[in-house]
Interface confidence: medium
């Protein structure tokens, strides 16, 4: 049993966490695919409604601890977080951690968690961001497919198969060019446009109250934009916005490109359709 | 749009408790992120903010009137509460409910207000 | 708490003029943390509830007019308005947002003159 001492600390701690909370953690993206030896970048955007001096962070995957540094006077306690991990924090609100070179151990469940500890104890937490690491090694597929009993008669089938293709695709580029001719329209590099392009770094009415009587750059699908910061929306500004979120405005601040956490949604625009988030501290 | 209407009675007699309801229309007051204060201005235009309920129902108050302040809320009626005890002519004033978003801790959307005097 | 002190109380412009208004804090609104200045600007106009101008200390409000300025940093703010046009006249209000409790200026009057 722990000491008086020990238990009134945290009976005062459980009491600070039942006051309003308006620390917020946005992490992103939901989802990251990057090829081995590549980068990634993960992104936690840390909000707070005023001022604070000393934020607790901490960044686990698979619920390992890879670093749990603090925030203060601007500046991050820890420059590294986990093999080959870097860490840096742009104000007014964004904890990026950029792993680079990717390994497939790297492969895994990020989240991201703040803290402020100064001036009073406020937590939340990201949602999981999962990293998926491709091979990028073609010897890794190397023995497999040369000790398959067969592996001639796959060298002849493809072979054969591109030969087809290449017939193929020379009879249709003779017809396109024709089409083209008579129609006069060009789709241009229409085929190739779709091709998804993988960065190494993926470079964002009121009432009276008389008183007398709150760029997109797409990268590729890894990344997306984060506009910096999350702007405010006024409540009374009419939006018609898809998202269930209100549309981001400009805002002073240097954008960090990474992904899109949008601002939370203006009370002028329709409720969610099935009713809104879960109600709780976060 | 999202609109606060205050509500309840304009004379409370001294060392009484006064009770106001703020309605909100148009906007869920569980919808996370936001806060749902009560300000108010006194005969001589100041200005005071006595505390706010959030989305999770967490409150936060004015030291001033921490002993004395209770806000609380209904979300079956999007509805949110002041209660202020043993009150004095000093707490006569006009009560706002407002509300703040967006985790900036300034105010966009207020209520019309209510006078409300502390008399015998 | 955090003492917001209004100069001048009130205030006497020509139209089309430049009216300033200022606002000391007792103790800094800066954050090295995010690099803001934690103080916001209201307008109150008779019969009517205060309205945001301003927040951090220069960044206006969706739909205020640009004759509105914020400025300052630290403990020294100052609201501009660049060209004073009839329907300005109000009561304007400074406010920090820097921390809890949430505290106001008293307040400065402006007038036409």
């Known amino acids: 049993m722990g000491s008086p001492g020990m238990v009134l600390g945290l009976l005062v701690q459980i009491w600070a966490l039942q006051e309003a909370s308006s620390l917020s953690v946005q992490q992103g993206p939901n989802l990251l695919q990057v090829r081995q030896g590549s980068q990634a970048t993960l992104v936690c955007q840390v909000d707070q409604a005023t001022a604070w001096e000393r934020l607790r962070v901490k960044w686990t995957k698979d619920g390992a601890i890879l670093c749990q540094p603090y925030i203060t006077n601007g500046s991050l306690s820890l420059g590294v977080c986990g093999p080959q991990g870097r860490l840096s924090w742009q104000a007014p609100s964004h904890l990026t951690l950029q792993l680079d070179p990717v390994s497939l151990n790297h492969s895994g469940a990020y989240v991201c968690w703040a803290a402020v500890e100064i001036p009073e104890l406020e937590e939340a937490e990201g949602n999981i961001t999962r990293l998926f690491v491709d091979p990028d090694d073609p010897t890794q597929n190397r023995n497999r497919i040369a000790s398959f009993p067969g592996f001639l008669f796959v060298l002849l089938g493809v072979g054969s198969m591109g030969v087809a293709a290449i017939v193929w695709g020379a009879w249709f580029w003779g017809r396109r060019s024709c089409q083209q001719r008579d129609s006069g329209n060009s789709p241009g590099n229409a085929f190739y446009s779709n091709v998804l392009y993988r960065p190494r770094g993926a470079p964002k009415k009121s009432e009276d109250c008389s008183g007398e009587g709150k760029d997109q750059r797409g990268q590729s699908i890894y990344s997306t934009s984060f506009p910096q910061p999350a702007p405010r929306q006024p409540h009374l500004a009419s939006r018609p916005c898809p998202s269930p979120r209100p549309c981001p405005s400009p805002r002073p601040g240097h954008p960090v490109s990474m992904v899109r956490v949008s601002p939370r949604p203006s009370p002028t625009q329709q409720p969610r359709p099935k009713g809104f988030p879960k109600v709780g501290e976060e | 749009q999202v609109q606060l209407q205050e509500s309840g009675p304009g004379l409370v007699k001294p060392a009484q408790t006064l009770s106001l309801t703020c309605t909100v229309s148009g906007f869920s007051i569980s919808t996370s992120g936001y806060y749902w204060s009560w300000i108010r201005q006194f005969p001589g235009k100041r200005l005071e903010w006595m505390g706010y309920i959030n989305y999770g129902g967490g409150t936060s108050y004015n030291p001033s009137l921490k002993s004395r302040v209770t806000i609380s809320r209904d979300t079956s009626k999007n509805q949110f509460s002041l209660k202020l005890t043993s009150v004095t002519a000093a707490d006569t004033a006009t009560y706002c409910c407002?509300?703040?978003?967006?985790?900036?801790?300034?105010?966009?959307?207020w209520g019309q207000g209510t006078m409300v005097t502390v008399s015998s | 708490d955090i003492v917001m002190t209004q100069s001048p109380d009130s205030l006497a412009v020509s139209l089309g003029e430049r009216a300033t208004i200022n606002c000391k804090s007792s103790?800094?609104?800066?954050?090295?943390?995010?690099?803001?200045?934690?103080l916001a600007w209201y307008q109150q106009k008779p019969g009517q509830p205060p309205k945001l101008l301003i927040y951090h200390a220069s960044t206006r409000e969706s739909g205020v007019p640009d004759r509105f300025s914020g400025s300052g940093s630290g403990t020294d703010f100052t609201l501009t308005i660049s060209s004073l046009q009839a329907e300005d006249v109000a009561v304007y209000y400074c406010?920090?947002?820097?921390?809890?409790?949430?505290?106001f200026g008293q307040g400065t009057k402006l007038e036409i003159k």
């Open positions: 103790q800094s609104l800066f954050s090295s943390n995010t690099n803001r200045n934690y």
């Open positions: 407002a509300t703040m978003a967006d985790r900036f801790a300034f105010f966009d959307v």
């Open positions: 406010q920090h947002h820097y921390e809890t409790p949430l505290t």
